[in-house]
Interface confidence: low
């Protein structure tokens, strides 16, 4: 597993990757497993009541690089981690939701302390 900012050596990605899915399962998934030519992901975000919700599933290869990059956006309390190294690899991903940050530490609208590790395996 690599920390943010570290480069990752390319790994052989199976042409069809199986991923655990939760809240993001396509209709043809069986036993909460989906298939993709791209990445498995696990994501945590806040619902409108402030409750953290974890979802997981498959991302297609097209566009998934951008989605997995997880650029920090103030206020959008969301964190996503992606993997490709083996089937169902996303069951071992545990992204954490960044909280609001003290204004002392930032300029502009606020406010995330990023304490999650970004597991992005190409």
């Amino acid at each position: 597993k690599k920390e943010d900012g570290e480069s990752t050596a390319p790994t052989a990605r199976p042409k069809v990757l199986r991923c655990k899915c939760h809240h993001h399962c396509p209709e043809d998934s069986v036993n909460n497993i989906c298939s993709t030519d791209g990445y498995c992901f696990t994501m945590i975000e806040e619902d409108d009541s402030g409750t953290p919700v974890v979802t997981s599933g498959c991302l297609g290869l097209e566009g998934s690089d951008f989605q997995c990059r997880d650029t920090p956006i103030p206020h959008q309390r969301r964190s996503i981690e992606c993997c490709t190294e083996r089937n169902e690899c996303n069951k071992d991903l545990h992204p954490t939701l960044p909280p609001l940050k003290d204004r002392d530490f930032v300029d502009g609208p606020i406010h995330h302390k990023h304490h999650h590790h970004h597991h992005h395996h190409h």
Partner: antibody, heavy 116, light 113 residues
Amino acid sequence: QVTLKESGPGILQPSQTLSLTCSFSGLSLSTPGMSVGWIRQPSGKGLEWLAHIWWNDDKSYNPALKSRLTISKDTSNNQVFLKIASVVTADTATYYCARGDRFAYWGQGTLVTVSA
Amino acid sequence: DIVMSQSPSSLAVSVGEKVTMSCKSSQSLLYSNNQKNYLAWYQQKPGQSPKLLIYWASTRESGVPDRFTGSGSGTDFTLTISSVKAEDLAVYYCQQYYSFPLTFGAGTKLELK
């Protein structure tokens, strides 16, 4: 069902340290994103946010009181603590704990009186 | 710090009347990336804890009667009670959760005429 309950000493003297406990159920401070805050309200007056603690032990304090405040947690026992050092009579208030940063769940409050 | 100003400080009303109260912030609470206003409204009855009524400036908390409506954006916000009931007599506070320190308005007290 989320419930929070504050407890404190009731009465203490100026210059002492106030220790408050927030005991809660129906939420866990080990859940990513979860936080608990402390708010106080002097009798007949408005609400003042004091401090906040998150699941990952991040902390935020009201700058006006920061030097006197310490917030901490005991995740396994579902408790959050607030200490206020060197209390003065102006610290007399009802102290509330609440979930999150928009406070959907509040405790019933505990009245603290600072009196010589 | 973001300063929250509420007006009026008190309001004498009759049951059935429509009521509006104002909350202004010293800086915008609208975040352009998600077009959300980081403002909440609370109701506090005598001897009770505050109760969340509205968040995101206009979203009613579950179980809150639809006579309560939040509106506004940026720095100017309004709480409207379409037809006041006796049980609505309370103090109403606005709060910003756009940045720390979290701050509250001084409150608007709703009283019977």
